[in-house]
Amino acid sequence: HTVELNNMFGQIQSPGYPDSYPSDSEVTWNITVPDGFRIKLYFMHFNLESSYLCEYDYVKVETEDQVLATFCGRETTDTEQTPGQEVVLSPGSFMSITFRSDFSNEERFTGFDAHYMAVDVDECKEREDEELSCDHYCHNYIGGYYCSCRFGYILHTDNRTCRVECSDNLFTQRTGVITSPDFPNPYPKSSECLYTIELEEGFMVNLQFEDIFDIEDHPEVPCPYDYIKIKVGPKVLGPFCGEKAPEPISTQSHSVLILFHSDNSGENRGWRLSYRAAGNECPELQPPVHGKIEPSQAKYFFKDQVLVSCDTGYKVLKDNVEMDTFQIECLKDGTWSNKIPTCKIVDCRAPGELEHGLITFSTRNNLTTYKSEIKYSCQEPYYKMLNNNTGIYTCSAQGVWMNKVLGRSLPTCLPECGQPSRSLPSLVKRIIGGRNAEPGLFPWQALIVVEDTSRVPNDKWFGSGALLSASWILTAAHVLRSQRRDTTVIPVSKEHVTVYLGLHDVRDKSGAVNSSAARVVLHPDFNIQNYNHDIALVQLQEPVPLGPHVMPVCLPRLEPEGPAPHMLGLVAGWGISNPNVTVDEIISSGTRTLSDVLQYVKLPVVPHAECKTSYESRSGNYSVTENMFCAGYYEGGKDTCLGDSGGAFVIFDDLSQRWVVQGLVSWGGPEECGSKQVYGVYTKVSNYVDWVWEQMGLPQSVVEPQVER
């Protein structure tokens, strides 16, 4: 009978064991274990009848298709074999053990006691067959194994071979190299590779196999295993395999598909090819006069590009358009995309207008082409070139007028200061009551009219100021303080300010320039109680044109001492001292109570201590600070009242030979104008030079040399 055994281990004994087995007995034990295991069989006791070649009694161990061992007897002889310590190992997961005894037994034989167990198969070590072993890596586990692949490879659906994903390779460059995967190492199995060369229409792809060519082949059948096919449109070249590379291939197409197939076996090194685009040839090129072509080649083919550029000082001219370079291209039909342009000399064109300046051409015929020269100069004597620049500009290769210092920036014509078109009488004797000023004697003199429309009726008043530049007026803060009903210091609204320049006779404003204010800046520390820091600036809406009747005054050097005692200075004004005169009357001037023509007076600077004492002796809280100085005569006289508030007290500076604003008419009195020992008090401008430059947004170094030269 047959016994089926499916356990992973077990024991098999002869019938009746440990007693003697019966005669004429046959038992088969079929042992089956799971796949991935084999069966190990060994005997602990063996005692059977001996016979030649085990013809009588025996134990036979076999698989489906082979006998693994036959045992009988008690000990091994030449013709019979006992298992002893031997282990029988099945090749697979099945083992059959048959016990047979014949009809007679001369002695009592105790039979056998055997044990079996399932043992793991290490497929990774034992698989010799290439068709079953792992392509790259094998991993054994109890009862089985699995395969894996190197980086970049994918396990095939057979779970054994390693393939690559190589069906999506696009080449668009004009030259390139294509190889089988992992070249020059053996290419992967079970792979379908597709390489597409897709160039611009007009190119033709040429293929050339290089170095090693090694694709698995067959002696009789053409390329049944692995192969390359080249598809050009509907036409297919190949298959190619073996060790001999195909000859160079001229595809005559811009689009080529290369297919590479590998099966699941073989170890071949693969292939490498280079491709190159070929195109039509274009005619030879001649560079333009005063120009060059890059790159310079003997031959040019489709898609080659050349850059036409010109020598320094010349520009490429194409269809009346100037450019630095021009590119042309060899087209697929073998013609150039454009004609070669010409090279034209650079033209800087008419130079930019210089504000308050003029231009002279150094080159004949007023040429404005490359290397031509011009010279800028300022409208003298009213303007002077900043930093004493040469004003010479050359037409550069870039087509712009260039100066060695300023580059492409234009020079700056700064207003000259403190130089009236008429000489001021620096040594005139004291003028009692003032004297008419000739036009142009005080070209910096400004009349400031403030009309505060926020009150009903509109509040109007005036003051004087001094022109510092084409855009800035210096005056006293109290003139430009909003006449609020409290003591806060707020500037008047700029919309309420009008400035008159070049005004000589208030009855005739035709020659005067009137300007609106863009900004009103009071000194931040102006004190309404004692008039300390009584200084302010007005920025004009537009710069005023300078001329004989409109010119700035110079600012002094920064010196806390201010003007020296007894120095003589001049103050100009229209002598508007009548409190009942309205501003309308001042501007339209239909009244005889004021001077129509600008008046001026010469006054000495009073020693500070003397002035302080004269004011301290009065009733009232008068304070002559270090930011003020006094001028006038001890014995009084109408002249001390001539200046309008904010007007400039100017002193001639011997060093620079210019008139410098040292003071601004600030306050005086409580007594009547011109009373004895009532000195006029002026803001000491030299204490505020830095503040003034800062507000005007100019570095001090820009203009100061005008005073110090």
Epitope: T453, S454, P457, H478, R481, R485, D486, N580
Partner: antibody
Framework: QVQLVQSGAEVKKPGASVKVSCKAS????????IEWVRQAPGQGLEWMGE????????DYNERFKDRATFTADTSTSTAYMELSSLRSEDTAVYYC??????WGQGTLVTVSS | DIVMTQSPDSLAVSLGERATINCKSS????????????LAWYQQKPGQPPKLLIY???TRESGVPDRFSGSGSGTDFTLTISSLQAEDVAVYYC????????FGGGTKVEIK
């Protein structure tokens, strides 16, 4: 025509606040000061303060600095005077004035418990 | 604050006669910058808001009859009604606006 129209009479309890409006028309509201003046029954005129609507600048009589607030809405050309912590002696006619020349009709504010 | 003192408190004048009202300020009202004297005169009739008559001490407001005139400078000022009319019966106030404004106490003008 140029005019200032004030809000109607108000009766308030002591400690409360009152807000009087003054609507301007016929001129550029933003560019002229609006003053506030009050007059207690049978008494003289008392200047409270002023506002320049365009800039929001204000001046206050010291006596009212802590209790009065002047504001202006330029979109509606209306000035406002708010007086807080009202007492019986604040009973008065409150006038708005364009600078010095043009007066509103006045608003009677009565403070009574 | 500048104190404005008006005199007399009340005044009875015959129709067609001159009426004079005085106003004294505790300090000068002349602004040295604008060169103006910031003194105004107002007329107030019962149940009406005040009306501006004179500004800058002596300038008559447009529409004001020329029988009204203002004078004075510094600290002493006068409003004169050269020929009193029935419609001139009112309370008259002076006001300074040199600094934060203050009003005089008022002068009541009646017909005698």
């Amino acid at each position: 025509q140029v005019q200032l129209v004030q809000s109607g009479a108000e009766v308030k309890k002591p400690g409360a606040s009152v807000k009087v409006s003054c609507k301007a028309s016929g001129y550029t509201f933003t560019g002229k000061w609006i003053e506030w003046v009050r007059q207690a029954p049978g008494q003289g005129l008392e200047w409270m303060g002023e506002i320049l609507p365009g800039s929001g600048s204000t001046d206050y009589n010291e006596r009212f600095k802590d209790r009065a607030t002047f504001t202006a809405d330029t979109s509606t050309s209306t000035a406002y005077m708010e007086l807080s912590s009202l007492r019986s002696e604040d009973t008065a006619v409150y006038y708005c004035v364009r600078s010095e020349d043009l007066w509103g009709q006045g608003t009677l504010v009565t403070v009574s418990s | 604050d500048i104190v404005m003192t008006q005199s007399p408190d009340s005044l009875a004048v015959s129709l067609g006669e001159r009426a004079t009202i005085n106003c004294k300020s505790s300090q000068s009202l002349l602004n040295s910058v604008t060169r103006k004297t910031y003194l105004a005169w107002y007329q107030q009739k019962p149940g009406q808001p005040p009306k501006l008559l004179i500004y800058w001490a002596s300038t008559r407001e447009s529409g004001v009859p020329d029988r009204f005139s203002g004078s004075g400078s510094g600290t002493d000022f006068t409003l004169t009604i050269s020929s009193l009319q029935a419609e001139d019966v009112a309370v008259y106030y002076c006001k300074q606006s040199y600094t934060l404004p203050t009003f005089g106490g008022g002068t009541k003008v009646e017909i005698k």
